[in-house]
Interface confidence: low
């Protein structure tokens, strides 16, 4: 029996309330609505959210009772579309409410915004949260929930709960502590980099499968679990895919409520059959139901069984190849993947994907040809050259990050990709290269055997940044076309770019490079961001310049900050070194 | 459990030279920016440095520039402030904090600077 086959009920509301619990429920409407009206202020999203909540609580009671029977998406849209200043705040997004389901929620989905303008989150001291967690702990907590799914309207809904759940704890423990900060800004500082490596995670999970296709998504799920799971059946595999693959498309779609309820009918399924899917399940399925669900999707993988036969045997010596492959052709594939994955925990998930796309493409030719097997006997040669392209690429990478470190590391990718997409925004730029440059601290300590899956896989989540940020507002071609042509092809795609050469320099703007005092002030990221668009602007506008020129430049960047922050009258310092700073660039520069 | 320990402090002569310890423990060191804060008697606390995670970039208080330096070494999770050319007004109760708060938690060290 399949695990989301459920009997029909009366009332959709009633049962994913009576499923989830009042708790869930009220903080997963509150995820919905926040992510759908990333404007509206946290009191009317909390209004909407108990109006919703008290409607459920009269359907629990009478199924039958009026507009029980709506559809989830009819009733959370007709209770967006009372917001008063619907039109004012989100424009044109107004007009989703003239439209029938489904194409209404189509259309807020379509108005998401994954760069949403609002201020950064400013943490208070933590005397000042201490206080405020004390005095209302409910509305502390959906405060968290409501700011964290504005800003990240693709985040996993059921995992938010999971981090609110951490949040609520290190508050618990620490504002009772003797140094609290001491013990509350560690914890905080680790949700808030898990926070923003899961949004991005399942960004990309959605791109997947909002861009390329429930296809695209499985076949990314088959490479990923036959990893984590070699000594499953691919029959037990492929069911935990199709599994999986509903509940991502459901959070993709907004439909939280369900989404969560089935992705802890899933965690029960694979706890209740661990046996057949693997031995590092243990300590996972002891845990309670949030927990439960975040150990299962970061469990290790699983070893692999001994003796795994060759491939080639099932795959190329076959005389049945052509057969098998044509009786069900993805069926065939998913086995490919499946086989392939589950020997090579070492590869990345992009690599295995593009080794099965080679042999899909190799089978559609030599199936039509005169000697099939003449034909693709030596297709696993050509694995080769796509093995050794990311294995070259994060070898000389992290022998550069080793000898630069990861401030420096970061400048390089920022010159290198500046150079590649100069039209692309200098924030846009600064954050996704800052990203790229964290690859070296996450992925080159690990051994040659985790390298690939660490970098390539972390790779592929960052350039999907860039690629939702500059969907929304297209300045490159170059950028679109990497993005769009390929999923698994985006990275080597990126690599492969040269310095656009079409490229009009920037003109000179003195304003761009001139610095006041406050940034003596600021902590020490704010002030490497700083420098690093300083770095991105002087690429924009002497796309040419060397290596050794830009050092120079911005060593004497570095210098003029810390001298200037040294001064007595700061901003007197900035206002007449700046000057002979930018003199001295347009010089070194030729500009 | 986070755990900050300072040692160093003592009784100096004006103009005279102290090197502060902090010794971590409970969380990963290397990841957290650290500074050092210190409270004088009847005062609040005032931050008066700090080092990013790395040991690259530094900052110090008005006050202090030019006579004080931090430090920091990963492998022995351990953060420094040497501080020379001490004057009275440097005497209070010096501790380590984990970023940049001024909340004070930790036991601290006694700097006493006699004129």
């Known amino acids: 029996r399949g695990v989301f086959r459920r009997d029909a009920h009366k009332s959709e509301v009633a049962h994913r309330f009576k499923d989830l619990g009042e708790e869930n429920f009220k903080a997963l409407v509150l995820i919905a609505f926040a992510q759908y009206l990333q404007q509206c202020p946290f009191e009317d999203h909390v209004k909407l959210v108990n109006e919703v909540t008290e409607f459920a609580k009269t359907c629990v009671a009478d199924e039958s009772a009026e507009n029980c029977d709506k559809s989830l998406h009819t009733l959370f849209g007709d209770k967006l579309c009372t917001v008063a200043t619907l039109r004012e705040t989100y424009g044109e997004m107004a007009d989703c409410c003239a439209k029938q389901e489904p194409e209404r929620n189509e259309c807020f989905l379509q108005h998401k915004d994954d760069n949403p303008n609002l201020p950064r989150l400013v943490r208070p001291e933590v005397d000042v949260m201490c206080t405020a967690f004390h005095d209302n702990e409910e509305t502390f907590l959906k405060k968290y929930l409501y700011e964290i799914a504005r800003r990240h309207p693709y985040f996993y809904a059921p995992e938010l709960l999971f981090f609110a759940k951490r949040y609520k704890a290190a508050f618990t423990e620490c504002c009772q502590a003797a140094d609290k900060a001491a013990c509350l800004l560690p914890k905080l500082d680790e949700l808030r980099d898990e926070g923003k490596a899961s949004s991005a995670k399942q960004r990309l999970k959605c791109a997947s499968l909002q861009k390329f296709g429930e296809r695209a998504f499985k076949a990314w799920a088959v490479a990923r679990l036959s990893q984590r799971f070699p000594k499953a059946e691919f029959a037990e595999v492929s069911k935990l895919v199709t599994d999986l693959t509903k509940v991502h498309t459901e959070c993709c779609h907004g439909d939280l409520l369900e989404c969560a309820d089935d992705r802890a009918d899933l965690a029960k399924y694979i706890c209740e059959n661990q046996d057949s899917i693997s031995s590092k399940l243990k300590e996972c399925c002891e845990k309670p139901l949030l927990e439960k669900s975040h150990c299962i999707a970061e469990v290790e993988n699983d070893e692999m069984p001994a003796d795994l036969p060759s491939l080639a045997a099932d795959f190329v010596e076959s005389k049945d190849v052509c057969k098998n492959y044509a009786e069900a052709k993805d069926v065939f594939l998913g086995m490919f993947l499946y086989e392939y994955a589950r020997r090579h925990p070492d590869y990345s998930v992009v690599l295995l994907l593009r080794l099965a796309k080679t042999y899909e493409t190799t089978l559609e030719k030599c199936c039509a040809a005169a000697d099939p097997h003449e034909c693709y006997a030596k297709v696993f040669d050509e694995f080769k050259p796509l093995v050794e392209e990311p294995q070259n690429l994060i070898k000389q990478n992290c022998e550069l990050f080793e000898q630069l470190g990861e401030y420096k590391f970061q400048n390089a990718l920022l010159v290198r990709y500046t150079k590649k997409v100069p039209q692309v925004s200098t924030p846009t730029l600064v954050e996704v290269s800052r990203n790229l440059g964290k690859v070296g601290s996450k992925c080159c300590k690990h051994p040659e055997a985790k390298r690939m899956p660490c970098a390539e896989d972390y790779l592929s989540v960052v350039l999907n940044q860039l690629c939702v940020l500059h969907e929304k507002t297209p300045v490159s071609d170059r950028v679109t076309k990497c993005c769009t042509e390929s999923l698994v092809n985006r990275r080597p795609c990126f690599s492969a770019l040269e310095v656009d050469e079409t490229y009009v320099p920037k003109e000179f703007n003195a304003e761009t490079f001139t610095f006041h005092a406050d940034i003596c002030t600021l902590s020490e990221k704010e002030r490497q961001i700083k420098k690093q668009t300083a770095l991105v602007e002087l690429v924009k506008h002497k796309p040419k310049a060397t290596k050794e020129q830009l050092k120079a430049v911005m060593d004497d960047f570095a210098a003029f900050v810390e001298k200037c922050c040294k001064a007595d009258d700061k901003e007197t310092c900035f206002a007449e070194e700046g000057k002979k700073l930018v003199a001295a660039s347009q010089a070194a520069l030729g500009l | 459990q986070v755990q900050l320990v300072e040692s160093g402090g003592g009784l100096v002569q004006a103009g005279g030279s102290l090197r502060l310890s902090c010794a971590a423990s409970?969380?990963?060191?290397?990841?957290?920016?650290m500074s050092w804060v210190r409270q004088a008697p009847g005062k609040g606390p005032e931050w008066v440095s700090a080092?990013?995670?790395?040991?690259?970039?530094?900052r110090y208080a008005e006050s202090v520039k030019g006579r004080f330096t931090i430090s920091r070494d990963n492998a022995k999770k351990t953060l420094y402030l040497q501080m020379n050319s001490l004057k009275p007004e440097d005497t209070a109760v010096y501790y380590c904090?984990?970023?940049?708060?001024?909340?004070?938690g930790s036991q601290g060290t006694q700097v006493t600077v006699s004129s």
């Open positions: 409970g969380f990963t060191f290397g990841s957290f920016g």
């Open positions: 080092i990013d995670s790395g040991g690259v970039d530094t």
């Open positions: 904090t984990i970023g940049q708060s001024t909340s004070r």
